[in-house]
């Protein structure tokens, strides 16, 4: 039997044991989060699979993920949404300590897909473990990119009160309009529900005392937000290590001074 021709993409293939990983993560998540105990993880996997299996992996739409989004519906209390851009690890360390704040990856759908890659093949029920489309080199409408765009949009749309965003002050573009935050989340905050966006600019160098809130890209962010009539605030986090320490132990005497 001749081996069937398989499309070669520029990106790495589906994460090994992808179905098992998604299912296991779902089970773990629903056990830990009582409000999601009603979720049937097999149905979640079926909906996830249905979004990309048998479909051309450069032609995935947000519509393909709607059944999954519906099953994973979750609400974050007002003032408790934390967005991030190019600084995922610190954002996650923060919400692990500050348990009442949530990043997208603290929600079921984000938790399921975090750090995973997946894609299928047109007209077959197989998962492609060899290669998947790269956003830049192949196409933007690939299963992974469309998933994150879809769930990020939804996460931003449902945010309310004061929304926080953690930004990487070590990057040349602290606010990057091409990031998921800059291209999706900012534009989907709902002005009738969101009173303000507060940016936390995380400094990299220990001796960096500059006011990065005056960075031109931050002013650009304020410009975008202001047109939507959402208030904008910005804080420098000069010492991220101390910042996390003070979240853990707010009574610590050293936490009374600036971070």
């Amino acid at each position: 039997v001749l081996p069937r021709w398989r499309q070669q993409w520029s990106g790495s293939g589906t994460t090994s044991r992808f179905p098992e990983t998604v299912l296991a993560r779902c089970v773990k998540y629903t056990e830990v989060h009582p409000e999601m105990r009603h979720v049937d993880c097999q149905s979640v996997w079926d909906a996830f699979k249905g979004a990309f299996i048998s479909k051309y992996p450069c032609n995935i739409t947000e519509e393909d993920y709607q059944p999954l989004v519906k099953l994973g519906t979750q609400t974050v209390p007002c003032n408790k949404t934390l967005l991030w851009s190019r600084i995922k690890d610190l954002a996650h360390q923060f919400t692990q300590v500050q348990r009442d704040m949530f990043t997208l990856e603290d929600m079921l759908l984000g938790y399921l897909a975090d750090d995973l890659t997946w894609c299928g093949e047109f007209n077959t029920f197989e998962i492609n473990y060899q290669s998947c489309p790269d956003w830049r080199k192949d196409c933007s409408n690939n299963p992974v990119s469309v998933f994150w765009k879809t769930v990020s949009r939804r996460f931003a749309e449902t945010a309310c009160g004061v929304v926080h965003v953690m930004l990487n002050g070590s990057r040349s573009k602290i606010f990057d309009k091409n990031s998921t935050f800059g291209s999706v989340e900012v534009h989907n905050l709902q002005p009738e529900k969101v009173q303000a966006l507060e940016a936390w600019v995380i400094h990299g160098g220990r001796e960096d005392s500059r006011d990065l809130c005056q960075d031109p890209t931050i002013k650009e962010l304020e410009s975008i937000i202001s047109k939507r009539n959402i208030r904008f605030f910005c804080k420098n986090i000069y010492r991220p290590d101390k910042f996390l320490q003070c979240v853990k132990n707010p009574e610590d005497s050293s936490c009374l001074s600036g971070i």
Partner: antibody, heavy 118, light 110 residues
């Protein structure tokens, strides 16, 4: 005193080109998003284009997309509008205006007239 | 055809109160910044109302504005002859990524 001063307008044949300039003074030019707005004779205001603070991002009205290019030189406190392949319907007074956060198009220049006619 | 809809003309006698309406949609007026501009004959537009309802310094308190849903309105009380001008509403439009204007209302003081 906060001021915007446009220049570069004139009479040009259809298909021709013009480059408009807008010199800013009295405020920190590099802190503001900048815009071009035009007004055809006897008509209303029409937004043409805007450019972000850093100049990295530009936006255009559908009517000028692909023909006009907005740019800025923060070191010279100057905004530009390169207009190519001009049409009769581009005839208008062209104003530059800064965008002030939470205010709107705050300060406007006096305008420069562009006439496209054969 | 303007994205925002304004009446082409309005008039009133000195001392009267005149209101100019501006109608839009969710992507502009409802959720975003709305401004009003005054353009006196032969001059550049001037920002009259910023941030939906605020008067920049130097604008008389005879000018006021309101916003409700997808509509906005400008009210001028104690009308004066120097108020004779064109008035434009404008808003940022999310879906177009553009500033959109009303067609303008020519105010005549009789």
């Amino acid at each position: 005193e906060v001021q915007l001063l446009e220049s570069g307008g004139g009479l040009v044949h259809p298909g021709g080109s013009l480059r408009l300039s807008c010199a800013a003074s009295g405020f920190t030019f590099s802190d503001y998003e900048m815009n071009w707005v035009r007004q055809a004779p006897g008509k209303g205001l029409e937004w043409v284009s805007s450019i972000s603070i850093t100049g990295d991002f530009t936006y255009y009205a559908d009517s000028v997309k692909g023909r006009f290019t907005i740019s800025r030189d923060n070191s010279k406190n100057t905004l530009y509008l390169q207009m190519n392949n001009l049409r009769a319907e581009d005839t208008a007074v062209y104003y530059c205006a800064n965008y002030k956060s939470y205010y709107g198009l705050d300060v406007w220049g006096q305008g420069t007239t562009v006439t496209v006619s054969s | 055809q303007s994205v925002l809809t304004q009446p082409p003309s309005a008039s009133g006698t000195p001392g009267q109160r005149v209101t100019i309406s501006c109608s839009g949609s969710n992507s502009n007026i409802r959720y975003n910044l709305v401004n009003w501009y005054q353009q006196l004959p032969g001059t550049a537009p001037k920002l009259l109302i910023s941030n939906n309802v605020q008067r920049p310094s130097g604008v008389p308190d005879r000018f006021s504005a309101s916003k409700s849903g997808t509509s906005a309105s400008l009210a001028i009380s104690g009308l004066q002859s120097e108020d004779e001008a064109d008035y434009y509403c404008a808003a940022w439009d999310d879906s177009l990524n553009a500033w959109v204007f009303g067609g303008g209302t020519k105010l005549t003081v009789l």
